[in-house]
């Protein structure tokens, strides 16, 4: 058993049929010695008396808020949560496996630039009685500071019969140099509590590997005289690291109709303009990627050909 | 310590081309190592990230773009002095800071070159003959060093009398290639910045 936060404790249980469970001793936070009784949650049934209460925690029915009283007055609370371990593996029931970039990916993180600011998100089908707490650091043995905000519900989607909820959090490395060469990864730890179930999820990454620039901005078209070709130009996104001559991007320019199966024109360039063939009912799209370290491409920025 | 904005004429910076070749060569070699050594811990997640130039050179700090010198987190206290003559310095206006930056890059290359050559000598003794260093990568390191054209003491190639542990050597190769790729990215950024300035 360990303390998650004040008056909240996590009991780690091997979860299998007829498991013996864990013996837990609760101590009432009071100077009083006599006349103390214990109850669980909203029940008025007295579980025991005395300053300490010994319980055998085997299942979720044994978890919950234990309260010690004296003469009708509440003295203190202890909330017990369960963390299940099945076949030596901690449970991951609360969050959905996003399976990208690989299986067992519960947390996904992205950074728009090298400033040390990044966003992580996760998915769940649970809508109520759900809380998250996020901690992060650079390295684990001698951790350096990363400050994370509160996790918030950022999107709701319908997936078949189920509703899916996306939560996200923003974090900022306390003293980040955009030009630095990372040798220690960022560690992100998410504590998830659903009702009386506790789970924790972690992710470890270098900022350079989670870079995904914003789409290029200010796409403009200029038709070329006596030609089917148009010159398309754009600018670096505002959120990208500066100076741009140091943090350079490369671009992919594509002309395509509404369907992905339609024919297309595609060209790659390090410049902020390109000449392509425009077709009726097609769109010109441009996306960006770090020129020197191939992490993710940005989303497309698009303008119609016409 | 930073790079000034007044540097060589645009497009005239002779090291840019070589630095692009360097990044390409080390990326290819790393990809080859990952594929060939698929049953060894050779991915970014699996290896320890070591920097053989740590406390010996200060390329990131010495080559910091002017715009980042206002960022407290980028200003490291490490001081290193370097020899300051090089053929990439195509303009007389080039400052001492830029010379410091380029000589730091040169020292990096020299250190990696020695490590790679030592490692290759060991790998050539491996009866499995599983992986060797790409001669193209070694040639590209050499070309960039020649373009930088700094005079410095020759670092002797390390020789080891004991029987090499090929497993450890291959793990070290992965660590070295990952670190060198990261440094090659920095070098490419620096050369691009200097070329544009």
């Amino acid at each position: 058993i360990w303390e998650l936060k004040k008056d909240v404790y996590v009991v780690e249980l091997d979860w299998y049929p007829d498991a013996p469970g864990e013996m837990v001793v609760l101590t009432c936070d009071t100077p009083e010695e006599d006349g103390i009784t214990w109850t669980l949650d909203q029940s008025s049934e007295v579980l025991g008396s005395g300053k300490t209460l010994t319980i055998q925690v085997k299942e979720f029915g044994d978890a919950g808020q234990y309260t010690c009283h004296k003469g009708g007055e509440v003295l203190s609370h202890s909330l017990l949560l369960l963390h299940k371990k099945e076949d030596g593996i901690w449970s991951t029931d609360i969050l959905k496996d996003q399976k990208e970039p690989k299986n067992k990916t519960f947390l996904r993180c992205e950074a728009k630039n090298y400033s040390g600011r990044f966003t992580c998100w996760w998915l769940t089908t649970i809508s109520t009685d759900l809380t998250f707490s996020v901690k992060s650091s650079r390295g684990s043995s001698d951790p350096q500071g990363v400050t994370c905000g509160a996790a918030t519900l950022s999107a709701e989607r319908v997936r078949g019969d189920n509703k899916e909820y996306e939560y996200s959090v923003e974090c900022q490395e306390d003293s980040a140099c955009p030009a630095a060469e990372e040798s220690l990864p960022i560690e992100v730890m998410v504590d998830a509590v659903h009702k009386l179930k506790y789970e924790n999820y972690t992710s470890s990454f270098f900022i350079r590997d989670i870079i995904k620039p914003d789409p290029p901005k200010n796409l403009q078209l200029k038709p070329l005289k006596n030609s089917r070709q148009v010159e398309v130009s754009w600018e670096y996104p505002d959120t990208w690291s500066t100076p741009h001559s140091y943090f350079s991007l490369t671009f992919c320019v594509q002309v395509q109709g509404k369907s992905k199966r339609e024919k297309k024109d595609r060209v790659f360039t390090d410049k902020t303009s390109a000449t392509v063939i425009c077709r009726k009912n097609a769109s010109i799209s441009v996306r960006a990627q770090d020129r020197y370290y191939s992490s993710s491409w940005s989303e497309w920025a698009s303008v119609p050909c016409s | 310590r930073n790079l000034p904005v007044a540097t060589p004429d645009p497009g005239m910076f002779p090291c840019l081309h070589h630095s692009q070749n360097l990044l390409r060569a080390v990326s290819n070699m790393l990809q080859k190592a990952r594929q060939t050594l698929e049953f060894y811990p050779c991915t970014s997640e699996e290896i320890d990230h070591e920097d053989i130039t740590k406390d010996k050179t200060s390329t990131v700090e010495a080559c910091l773009p002017l715009e980042l010198t206002k960022n407290e987190s980028c200003l490291n206290s490490r001081e290193t002095s370097f020899i300051t003559n090089g053929s990439c310095l195509a303009s007389r206006k080039t400052s001492f800071m830029m010379a410091l930056c380029l000589s730091s890059i040169y020292e990096d290359l020299k250190m990696y070159q020695v490590e790679f050559k030592t490692m290759n000598a060991k790998l050539l003794m491996d009866p499995k003959r599983q992986i060797f260093l790409d001669q193209n990568m070694l040639a590209v390191i050499d070309e960039l060093m020649q373009a930088l054209n700094f005079n410095s003491e020759t670092v002797p190639q390390k020789s080891s009398l004991e029987e090499p542990d090929f497993y450890k050597t291959k793990i070290k190769l992965c660590i070295l290639l990952h670190a060198f790729r990261i440094r090659a990215v920095t070098i490419d950024r620096v050369m691009s910045y200097l070329n544009a300035s």
Partner: antibody, heavy 118, light 107 residues
Framework: QVQLVQSGAEVKKPGASVKVSCKAS????????LHWVRQAPGQGLEWMGW????????EYAPKFQGRVTMTTDTSTSTAYMELRSLRSDDTAVYYC???????????WGQGTMVTVSS | EIVMTQSPATLSVSPGERATLSCRAS??????LHWYQQKPGQAPRLLIY???QSISGIPARFSGSGSGTEFTLTISSLQSEDFAVYYC?????????FGGGTKVEIK
């Protein structure tokens, strides 16, 4: 599967014209761009131009501008390349090539040998 | 127009050996570079597109790399069916242009 079948060999006199055909099968004809590439005996490849069968848009290499015409007949899924004012150095194998992507060539015809000789 | 230069013109290699073919562009073309193989009496066949992207059905021994002005096609272990002429082609701008080819012959 996607296939391009070209017309047979031609022998032409200098100053004449030649029209080579390329019949497509195995895909929707208007879904691919169609290019013409030629190869003189023992020489390399030379791009001549492209046509979009969907709308008849064309782009020709400057070298052939004014001397070449590329057309398509969507009813028969056939592309044509006509080259006028033939010279002896136009002697080559003429290939049609197609792709969903405009700028490179995924599927090739078997080639048509055009000999220009007096 | 962009001029593509391939080297060497002829490469003599023993079966099982590695072959490295080079292609240089007269100006930077990013990764807009494609490789073809042509055997005598046959049409060319696409091997690699956009410098390094492999094509399904093409053996894994063929790989491409490069960007900017210098590109390489590598055949890791030459098989008898790989002896042919190899062409690079740029798609950075029109007119599309090819290199002069590299003939890979048996040593």
């Amino acid at each position: 599967q996607v296939q391009l079948v070209q017309s047979g060999a031609e022998v032409k006199k200098p100053g004449a014209s030649v029209k080579v055909s390329c019949k497509a099968s195995g895909y929707a004809f208007t879904d691919y761009y169609l290019h013409w590439v030629r190869q003189a005996p023992g020489q390399g490849l030379e791009w001549m131009g492209w046509i979009d069968p969907e709308n008849g848009d064309t782009e020709y290499a400057p070298k052939f501008q004014g001397r070449v015409t590329m057309t398509t007949d969507t009813s028969t899924s056939t592309a044509y390349m006509e080259l006028r004012s033939l010279r002896s150095d136009d002697t080559a194998v003429y290939y049609c090539a197609a792709n969903k992507e405009l700028r490179y060539f995924d599927v090739w015809g078997q080639g048509t040998m055009v000999t220009v000789s007096s | 127009e962009i001029v593509m230069t391939q080297s060497p013109a002829t490469l003599s290699v023993s079966p099982g050996e590695r072959a490295t073919l080079s292609c240089r562009a007269s100006q930077s073309i990013s990764i807009n570079l494609h490789w073809y193989q042509q055997k005598p009496g046959q049409a060319p066949r696409l091997l690699i597109y956009f410098a390094s992207q492999s094509i399904s059905g093409i053996p894994a021994r063929f790989s491409g790399s490069g960007s900017g002005t210098e590109f390489t096609l590598t055949i890791s272990s030459l098989q008898s069916e790989d002896f042919a002429v190899y062409y690079c082609q740029q798609s950075n701008s029109f007119p599309l242009t090819f290199g002069g080819g590299t003939k890979v012959e048996i040593k």
